[in-house]
Interface confidence: low
């Protein structure tokens, strides 16, 4: 009767800890399943805010784009609107741009009409008083759309109309005749007379938008 | 002795029972933390993710003020007359001369003053390679607005802004003191610190005109 | 350090030509003008003319205006200078030398025109 | 053309003197002038530039002055390696042009 009274002690006891922790298990198993909606929850809203990144890019993008759109219609609103394209000099009625690279008279012609202008043609005193002034403090020499096939033609613009012979002398090699003719050039206010073949600076000239603005 | 033996049998049911119950108990304890270090790792995705989405936020705030901004300019722009005036050289937003006349420093700081400019500032490499191709045909030194009192001053631009040192380098007599202090040029591309004294031709530079007339 | 090394003395016929290299070391070739200076017991010395080898434009001093040509080769740093239809009055030390004022100068190349 | 004209050919001077050697524009160069040093058999060397500015490398003795049409180069306490010609060459404009050049001998 000792040993069952023990017994039934110790049975008392294993009962109440299998109770309690019964009661630990399904507490835990409460507290699992709210992690559980938890953390999906928080999947969720990391959906939600990868969904919102995204968005946000394709709209940052789409900004940007935008961006680039309205600065390119500056540069060319900005264009149409002044007188003479960005880099070149406003004179009067005309738009000088003095070349940065060395080149034959007939490369720099081409450059120039890359540009939708011609090489410089000088029409006045006052022309040649700017031209004059605007290169003088180089020591260079700027190759003009002035040029003749051989001693025995007329000197001619690009344009085909003759040189005004009381515009300026032409120095230099005015009597030698090169196979690719001969092309008129500006050195310190000075015009000479060289071979189209030998490379030199360039002043391209174009007439100035001066429409209502 | 029989209720003994049944009872010890429950007692032996019941110390099963509870060790499996333990046993489970430790399982979840494990799994519970999984899941605690789980959601750790889902609020830190979180937290960055938030971070991203506010910084693509400010980011897109800036790029839709830069939008507005380049709306307005280009419906100014649309309606403005010539950014510069006759001469000048336009290049961004500036406004370019160089002069045709050989002065010292201090008067040639005058004449610029006098056409509304200031000698010219170099704010970035862009600009530098702008003004080093524009003067690539002269071998002639142009004044800038660099100065500085003496060799114990630092370089100051007109506005009183220092120069950046990673700009360019100033060569020449840089270490030499003049009564009338030492001044900048730019010639050839390189920069040269001399007597502002001594004449040279320089560069005026102004806003170029992008207001609405 | 800069260095300009200069092609070695030439002795041509007259009327012949003859071309002098001038080779840059220790700076950007294409940033400097290279000047091209003549010197003899009787002118001293005279400027002939300049390169400007990033651009290739060229510069001459009326007197030497289809007597010398001057050109550049970008890709070996090379500036060179061709003297035609010689004469004993050519004969002289011809130096390359670097921008303005010149800073640096070749050892010169000694060029005798003799029949 | 700008002619330079230095008016001593020759200059003879003791070790240890001084000596002024003159170079004249025939128009104003606004300071574009510079001195070379030539030692027989050598090439020219810069020694001033701007008229004033002294070269890295070159020894204190040496000094430039003037300004217009004037110029000067002035040698204190000369020592033996100083014997040479020395020219002047204005860069303001093309031709850049050079002096005659004076040649300086120990007396």
């Known amino acids: 009767s000792q040993v069952s009274n023990l017994l039934k002690q110790q049975q008392t006891n294993l009962t109440h800890q299998k109770n309690k922790l019964e009661g630990q298990i399904s507490a835990r198993q409460q507290a699992e399943e709210a992690s559980q909606e938890s953390q999906n929850e928080l999947k969720e809203m990391i959906e939600t805010l990868a969904w919102k990144l995204n968005e946000k890019s394709k709209e940052q993008m789409e900004l940007h784009h935008q961006n680039l759109n309205l600065q390119e219609t500056l540069k060319r609103v900005a264009n149409c609107s002044a007188p003479c394209p960005q880099d070149w000099i406003w004179h009067e009625e005309n738009c000088y741009l003095f070349s940065t690279g060395s080149f034959n008279w007939e490369k720099s012609q081409e450059k120039c009409l890359s540009l939708d202008a011609k090489l410089l043609k000088i029409n006045s005193t006052a022309d040649l008083d700017f031209i004059q002034q605007a290169i003088s403090y180089s020591s260079f020499p700027f190759w003009m759309g002035l040029s003749r096939r051989n001693p025995s033609y007329p000197w001619l613009w690009e344009d085909g109309s003759p040189l005004m012979p009381h515009l300026f002398r032409i120095r230099g090699a005015v009597s030698q005749t090169y196979p690719s003719g001969t092309c008129a050039y500006i050195q310190r206010g000075a015009v000479y007379a060289e071979n189209c073949i030998l490379a030199a600076f360039s002043i391209c000239q174009k007439k100035a938008n001066l429409r209502a603005q | 002795s029989q209720v003994s033996n049944l009872l010890k049998q429950q007692q032996t049911n019941l110390t099963h029972q509870k060790n499996k119950l333990e046993g489970q108990i430790s399982a979840r304890q494990q799994a519970e933390e999984a899941s605690q270090e789980s959601q750790n790792e889902l609020k830190e995705m979180i937290e960055t993710l938030a971070w991203k989405l506010n910084e693509k936020s400010k980011e897109q705030m800036e790029l839709h003020h830069q939008n507005l901004n380049l709306q307005e300019t280009l419906k100014r722009v649309a309606n403005c007359s010539a950014p510069c005036p006759q001469d000048w050289i336009w290049h961004e937003e500036n406004c370019y001369l160089f002069s045709t006349g050989s002065f010292n420093w201090e008067k040639s700081q005058e004449k610029c003053l006098s056409l509304d400019a200031k000698l010219l500032k170099i704010n970035s490499t862009a600009d530098l390679d702008f003004i080093q191709q524009a003067i690539s045909y002269s071998s002639f030194p142009f004044w800038m607005g660099l100065s500085r009192r003496n060799p114990s001053y630092p370089w100051l631009w007109e506005d009183g802004s220092p120069l950046m040192p990673h700009l360019f380098r100033i060569r020449g007599a840089v270490s030499q003191t003049y009564p009338s202090g030492t001044c900048a040029y730019i010639q050839r591309g390189a920069v040269y610190a001399e007597n502002c004294i001594l004449a040279a031709f320089s560069i005026c530079q102004k806003k170029a005109n992008l207001r609405a007339q | 350090q800069v260095q300009l090394q200069q092609s070695g003395a030439e002795l041509v016929r007259p009327g012949a030509s003859v071309k002098l290299s001038c080779k840059a070391l220790g700076y950007t070739f294409t940033d400097y003008e290279m000047h091209w200076v003549k010197q003899t017991p009787v002118h001293g010395l005279e400027w002939i003319g300049a390169i400007h080898p990033g651009s290739g434009g060229a510069a001459y001093i009326q007197k030497f205006k289809g007597k010398a040509t001057l050109t550049a080769d970008k890709s070996s740093s090379t500036a060179h200078m061709e003297l035609s239809s010689l004469t004993s009055e050519d004969s002289a030390v011809y130096y390359c030398?670097?921008?303005?004022?010149?800073?640096?100068w070749g050892q010169g190349t000694s060029v005798t025109v003799s029949s | 053309d700008i002619q330079m004209t230095q008016s001593s050919s020759y200059l003879s001077v003791s070790l240890g003197g001084r000596v002024t050697i003159t170079c004249k524009a025939s128009?104003?160069?606004?300071?574009?002038l510079a001195w070379y040093q030539q030692k027989p058999g050598n090439a020219p060397r810069l020694l001033i530039s701007?008229?004033?500015s002294l070269e890295t490398g070159v020894p204190s003795r040496f000094s430039g002055s003037g300004s217009g049409k004037d110029y000067t180069l002035s040698i204190t306490g000369l020592q033996t390696e100083d014997v040479a010609t020395y020219y002047c060459q204005q860069y303001l404009i093309t031709p850049y042009t050079f002096g005659g050049g004076t040649k300086l001998e120990i007396k």
């Open positions: 701007g008229a004033t």
């Open positions: 030398t670097r921008w303005l004022p010149m800073d640096y």
């Open positions: 128009d104003h160069i606004n300071n574009w």
